[in-house]
């Protein structure tokens, strides 16, 4: 069957019908419904929401909707023994204690089961000691402290401001520096935009607001007790001492009112420069310890959280494909939230719900997509991407053979300025073409395309007249699909103006103040940005599932491979003498990239010319496109990160949220001048160049004529 035989509507009308069916008012209604109570992973409330979504997706017309459950390691505060931080005097008396909860927002005072701020998976402990302020606790911040300022964090409690990098990386860095505890806080410099009021009068973080979040370093493992395999009924679980990625020192988050009380007493060294100063009225001294009269006072942490194996539930909906039911396009986003989830995740879940409803409406009218569409409502994303990873582990054999694409659908908004897209280069042309067909929701761009407003507000740094599209990193549910399985992936959301708003994420991220009202009053009263995101995400899924030829352009991969090779070569060339001494050459990598470019170009020519009415040839060409992303997977994975297997992209070893290109080579080169055995270090660089060159060449050959 051709795709037209699979439907009673013409292809052009299909997409239009699907997009026209998406309604802002429905997204608004769904968001309201999803945000009235907390939906913390592992709780009864979140199980009930899973069953509600299952029921509604069935009503919307999906062919089947199932719950997939797993028993994974989660973390909760002790309800009778709260976590807090004290300043203690020389007699051990607590002279200051941090707050035990966030003041609830108006209208939510009587809501039960609001989990107090905590760092998920923190071990228990009551360390006490001198404080050291470590800025953002990035790798370079600890380099500054240890190598430049000669400050030893060993045996100290460190206080770090949130932002710039994933909190798990901060904790890992602190552990490596020898710290015995970590305090995380939100500085107004990063979470309070100038000229905006704090919630409930605006979208800024109040002084009592606190960011929750997990502090794991899973590196793609999923459930810490069952790495590589699903946490099912007959799972073999590791002991807690062998669990993957758990922190070894107590960690706790606080707001800026409490942080002020700790930081105002800091002594020791002045901050090294302006980049270490936030916006509080404190000197931002680094320490160690308190100043003058307070020098005998210490900081003490009281952490009593527990790790518990708990049942979680994914909702998996299926819309069977009419022509290629064994080819899967997946739209997934998480359902679990820290508290109300006004933005994260429910602004995304509401969009998925409306996309499912629209597809269901078309299906009820007799239409089917060419390929199968799977819809997923993931659980326990906030606890380490657990729901999506366990499901992918359980279904890995199907996914690696049948997975065409994965589109992520977490928060639809993190601002209301312009579109933000991170995706595989295979999807660049799809995203460009789609956004040219969609209307911009932006003020001043009435009647203009989304592509035009996006390009104007967020121009590509390399190509004029094109918008910026970023590399995929991690910190969301696409991770297992892209980084482990090599399934082409993408994500889209509306974002802030990064030029003028330099705070990290959005101010109320993971706080109790992330409510429906936050979105409805301050971010998107008309829900027009949500609708646009629904059109982008839904439109991508529609095209991926319905195009006769997959909408992937392998030539765009060739372009970025050359850019990434140039970049890693220039990093290496900062050490010209060593490259000479150890005979380090990038010739093999550049040669492989050149071959890839030529083969991709020829493949694209054949793609224009082949007989699309021949189902065997069509399937063959589509399979070459589908399996191209898979060809970048190294079955052995990256050094010490076996579940990050993509050779071209991986989450940065220094920031899980950021993507790094040629990560194997990058990590081998990182801080190479400090390695004790330069010969061994440069040998590893050479090995990583070899792996990268081989992988690019092997991927190129998958695009060659098959015989």
């Amino acid at each position: 069957k051709s795709s037209n035989e699979a439907t009673n509507i013409t292809p052009k009308h299909n997409m239009k019908a699907f997009l026209d069916e998406l309604k802002a008012e429905n997204i608004k209604k769904f968001l309201y419904n999803f945000t009235q109570i907390p939906h913390l992973a592992g709780t009864e409330q979140n199980f009930q929401l899973a069953k509600q979504i299952q029921s509604q997706w069935k009503e919307f017309g999906l062919d089947s909707v199932e719950l997939a459950h797993y028993d994974v390691l989660l973390s909760y505060p002790n309800k009778t023994h709260p976590n807090y931080i004290s300043i203690i005097n020389e007699d051990g008396n607590e002279i200051f204690n941090t707050s035990l909860f966030e003041p609830p927002p108006p209208g939510y005072e009587n809501v039960s089961d609001i989990v107090p701020p905590f760092s998920a998976f923190s071990p228990q402990g009551m360390p006490e000691g001198d404080l050291v302020y470590v800025n953002y606790a990035r790798t370079e911040d600890f380099f500054k402290l240890e190598r430049d300022m000669k400050i030893n964090c060993s045996g100290k409690i460190v206080i770090a401001r949130y932002g710039k990098v994933f909190r798990g990386n901060k904790v890992k860095n602190a552990q490596l520096a020898g710290a015995k505890g970590v305090i995380l806080y939100s500085d107004p410099a990063d979470y309070f935009a100038p000229g905006v009021k704090s919630y409930p009068d605006g979208w800024n973080l109040p002084g009592g607001g606190v960011q929750r979040g997990n502090i794991l370093n899973l590196n793609g493992a999923g459930d810490p007790l069952t790495p590589g395999y699903p946490a099912n009924e007959y799972a073999y679980r590791r002991g807690i001492a062998e669990a993957v990625g758990l922190p070894s020192i107590p960690v706790h988050p606080i707001g800026y009112y409490d942080a002020q009380k700790l930081l105002e007493k800091m002594g020791g060294s002045a901050p090294p420069d302006s980049s270490w100063r936030g916006s509080l009225k404190v000197p931002y001294n680094v320490g160690p310890g308190f100043t003058g009269n307070f020098s005998t006072q210490k900081v003490k942490m009281h952490i009593h959280s527990t790790n518990e194996v708990t049942r979680i539930y994914n909702v998996i909906g299926t819309l069977r494909g009419a022509v290629e039911p064994d080819r899967y396009v997946i739209l997934g986003g998480h359902r679990d939230s820290w508290v109300f989830g006004g933005i994260d995740p429910q602004s995304g879940a509401a969009v998925v719900h409306e996309i499912v409803r629209s597809f269901g409406t078309l299906k009820k009218e007799g239409w089917r997509p060419r390929r199968t569409i799977l819809f997923a409502s993931w659980d326990a994303e906030e606890f380490g991407l657990l729901g999506s990873t366990e499901w992918a582990e359980e279904n890995s054999r199907l996914l690696q053979e049948r997975g065409v694409a994965y589109i992520n659908a977490d928060s639809s908004i993190e601002g209301n300025y312009t579109l933000r897209v991170d995706c595989t280069p295979l999807m660049y042309s799809l995203v460009h073409n789609l956004t040219k067909e969609l209307k911009s929701p932006d003020e001043g761009f009435e009647g203009k395309s989304l592509y035009e407003s996006w390009t104007k507000k967020s121009p590509s740094p390399e190509f004029s007249g094109m918008p910026r599209i970023s590399k995929l990193g991690s910190g969301n549910d696409f991770e297992v699909f892209f980084q482990r399985l090599g399934i082409a992936s993408g994500r889209a959301r509306y974002t802030k103006n990064w030029e003028t708003n330099k705070f990290s994420g959005y101010p109320l991220y993971h706080s109790v103040y992330e409510t429906y009202e936050l979105v409805e009053k301050f971010y998107d009263p008309m829900f027009k940005y949500h609708l646009t995101v629904a059109q982008v995400r839904g439109g991508m899924v529609f095209e991926l599932a319905n195009s006769i030829v997959l909408p992937f352009d392998c030539r765009d991969y060739a372009v970025v491979l050359r850019k990434y090779a140039d970049k890693i070569y220039s990093i290496s060339m900062k050490h010209p003498q060593e490259m000479k001494t150890y005979s380090v050459s990038f010739d093999s990598l550049f040669s492989a990239v050149k071959n890839f470019t030529e083969i991709a170009s020829k493949f694209s020519e054949r793609l224009q010319d082949f007989d699309k009415s021949n189902p065997i040839v069509l399937r063959m060409m589509n399979d070459q496109l589908m399996f191209l992303e898979r060809a970048f997977i190294d079955p052995l994975g990256l050094p010490d990160r076996p579940f990050y297997r993509h050779v071209i992209y991986a989450p940065s070893s220094h920031n899980k949220y950021a993507g790094e290109s040629f990560p194997g080579i990058y990590d081998a080169l990182f801080d190479i001048e400090s390695k004790v055995d330069p010969s061994k270090a440069w040998g590893e660089v050479k090995r990583q160049i070899y792996v990268a060159a081989f992988t690019v060449q092997a991927a190129a050959e998958t695009l060659s004529e098959v015989a």
Epitope: K144, K150, S274, N293
Partner: antibody, heavy 115, light 107 residues
Framework: EVQLVQSGAEVKKPGASVKVSCKTS????????IHWVRQAPGQSLEWMGN????????TYNQKFQGRVTITVDKSTSTAYMELSSLRSEDTAVYYC????????WGQGTLVTVSS | DIVMTQSPDSLAVSLGERATLSCRAS??????VAWYQQKPDQSPKLLIY???TRHTGVPDRFTGSGSGTDFTLTISSLQAEDVAVYFC?????????FGAGTKVEIK
């Protein structure tokens, strides 16, 4: 071994600007703070400001605020200090120093301000 | 600004004898104090940081001590090559400030 090599002596008229360079080698440039310090003839040391070469973060002595600008060029591992609106009392030897604790010093650059 | 007051202005000590240099901060600076040696027509050199930690390659006859407001640099056995001006400096708060220096000579 760590070396900081500064540009040569300068003679300037009052009201003019001077830009002194400090080329570093023998260490990872982005790792150490660069400070600028001056020493008037027969006098003590006076801190002018510093920069984090990794991200360009600066802190200036308010005494010089608005007159001094410290920059870096990572590609050449070089730091610069520009002092504007020069007056006769700015006559001094200007030093760059690498490391938060002024671990390594340049040889100094004599700037003479005279009409 | 924190004022660093050094005493004495100059000090003459016999070869092999102990030299004790003092530095007082106008307010508590913890242990965020460094000491530098400047020989005639040379750039200063770091001797001590964190009040008492010797910089790499500094002979162990140089010892720093103190915390809060009072700091001392001791040269346990003066050598001819130690003739120089010694500066203390605080890095507890901006602006970073130096003392006026103590000139050490051979008696």
């Amino acid at each position: 071994e760590v070396q900081l090599v500064q540009s040569g002596a300068e003679v300037k008229k009052p009201g003019a600007s001077v830009k002194v360079s400090c080329k570093t080698s023998g260490y990872t440039f982005t790792e150490y703070t660069i400070h600028w310090v001056r020493q008037a003839p027969g006098q003590s040391l006076e801190w002018m400001g510093n920069i984090n070469p990794n991200n360009g973060g600066t802190t200036y002595n308010q005494k010089f605020q608005g007159r001094v600008t410290i920059t870096v060029d990572k590609s050449t591992s070089t730091a610069y200090m520009e002092l504007s609106s020069l007056r006769s009392e700015d006559t001094a030897v200007y030093y760059c120093a690498a490391g938060w604790n002024f671990d390594y010093w340049g040889q100094g650059t004599l700037v003479t301000v005279s009409s | 600004d924190i004022v660093m007051t050094q005493s004495p202005d100059s000090l003459a000590v016999s070869l092999g004898e102990r030299a004790t240099l003092s530095c007082r901060a106008s307010q508590d600076v913890g242990t965020a104090v460094a000491w530098y040696q400047q020989k005639p027509d040379q750039s200063p050199k770091l001797l001590i940081y964190w009040a008492s930690t010797r910089h790499t390659g500094v002979p162990d006859r140089f010892t720093g001590s103190g915390s809060g407001t009072d700091f001392t640099l001791t040269i346990s056995s003066l050598q001819a090559e130690d003739v120089a001006v010694y500066f203390c400096q605080q890095y507890n708060s901006y602006p970073l400030t130096f003392g006026a220096g103590t000139k050490v000579e051979i008696k």
